[in-house]
């Protein structure tokens, strides 16, 4: 679809092309399974264009269908920590607030591996906060080429 000259001069956010790519900041304290994310040019190859961070969690500011993607690599990894017979070691991405919209969007398990990755298209609404929960005793890598999380607005 061709853009008019006026549209070409508008920032991407105003066209609805919200996009974010985040890197891991830290894990939560005991009893908090959430991963806490950070983004911005000063941190390297991470950025937010439209979505925003709320206490390390990604908040959507524009309704639409989004591509959500995530990769997590474990810094402490062993055959036991990734075995189904050990702890339930899963990564779940979901809408955690508002409570009325709470739902799991992605669920992945570490099966004999140190890295998991997935993506999906899903409708998201303004105000949705996405949480990434890592269950089990796991320590993810903070290397930016190993652990990252992002969203990309695709269409209304």
């Amino acid at each position: 679809q061709r853009l008019s000259r006026a549209q070409q001069q508008l920032p991407l956010e105003s066209l609805g092309w919200d996009i974010a790519e985040l890197q891991l900041n830290h894990t939560g304290p005991q009893q908090d399974p959430r991963l806490y994310w950070q983004g911005g040019p000063a941190l390297g190859r991470s950025f937010l264009r439209g979505p925003e961070l709320d206490k390390g969690q990604l908040r959507i500011r524009r309704d639409g269908i989004y591509m959500v993607h995530i990769q997590v690599t474990l810094a402490i990894c062993s055959s036991t920590s990734t075995s189904r017979h050990h702890h339930p070691t899963t990564l779940a991405v979901g809408i955690c607030s508002p409570a009325s919209r709470s739902i799991s969007l992605l669920r992945l398990s570490f099966h004999q591996g140190c890295t998991i990755a997935s993506q999906r298209l899903t409708p998201l609404a303004r105000g949705d906060t996405l949480c990434t929960n890592l269950t089990g005793t796991l320590l993810p890598s903070r290397n930016t080429d190993e652990t990252f999380f992002g969203v990309q607005w695709v269409r209304p």
């Epitope: 830290h26 005991q30 810094a75 990894c77 062993s78 005793t137």
Partner: antibody
């Protein structure tokens, strides 16, 4: 300047307990995972235990699992190792060590170590 | 558990000579996650190399690491008097994180 200072070592009888401490300074303690590594006299280095920066994740070598407990107090910039049911083979110099920012357990700073001797 | 075997046990060399230290793993190390440390008597280990070949902050460029899979090498291009010490390799690709038992570099 990053500094790690261990304390709490000493002579203890088999079956006894000891609590090691590691006081950290010169870096944002809560940001970094930490480990304990030990070295028996004239022997190889052995990784003992690790803990995430937030304290939410703890990890142990099989040789100490169920006997040792790693913990941290980020408000005091201090790492701990509670050692119970001590055995003669636990005799070693115990080092606290800071993980790289990536969280991977290679150790860019070490303390000077504290000697634990388990003997009757 | 990955077993790391270091050789030789002792290396007798003179200052200015080249030192080549070997570390062999019992199985392939994930992503070449191998580190090298230097330890002098009565001191804590000091990180030299991580990721098999990346020099740690402040480490002189006479120290270099190489290798992949199961075979790794630490090279000291020209030995300085302060380089005589024990050198350990460590794998951190898989728990438990294991160390080799060291190579002692001594003055000939």
């Amino acid at each position: 300047e990053v500094q790690l200072l261990e304390s709490g070592g000493g002579l203890v009888q088999p079956g006894g307990s000891l609590r090691l401490s590691c006081a950290a300074s010169g870096f944002t303690f809560s940001t970094y995972a930490m480990s304990w590594v030990r070295q028996a006299p004239g022997k190889c280095l052995e990784w003992v235990s690790a803990i995430s920066g937030s304290g939410g994740g703890t990890f142990y070598a099989e040789s100490v699992k169920g006997r040792f407990t790693i913990s941290r107090d980020n408000s005091k910039n201090t790492l701990y190792l509670q050692m119970n049911s001590l055995r003669a083979e636990d005799t070693a110099v115990y080092y606290c060590a800071k993980h790289d920012y990536s969280n991977y357990p290679y150790f860019d700073y070490w303390g000077q170590g504290t000697l634990v001797t388990v003997s009757s | 558990e990955i077993v790391l075997t270091q050789s030789p046990g002792t290396l007798s060399l003179s200052p200015g000579e080249r030192a080549t230290l070997s570390c062999r793993a019992s199985q392939s190390i994930r992503s070449n996650y191998l580190a090298w440390y230097q330890q002098k008597p009565g001191q804590a280990p000091r990180l030299l190399i991580y990721g098999a070949s990346s020099r740690a902050t402040g480490i002189p460029d006479r120290f270099s690491g190489s290798g992949s899979g199961t075979d790794f090498t630490l090279t000291i291009s020209r030995l300085e008097p302060e380089d005589f010490a024990v050198y350990y390799c460590q794998q951190y690709g898989s728990s438990p994180f294991t160390f080799g038992c060291g190579t002692k570099v001594e003055i000939k």
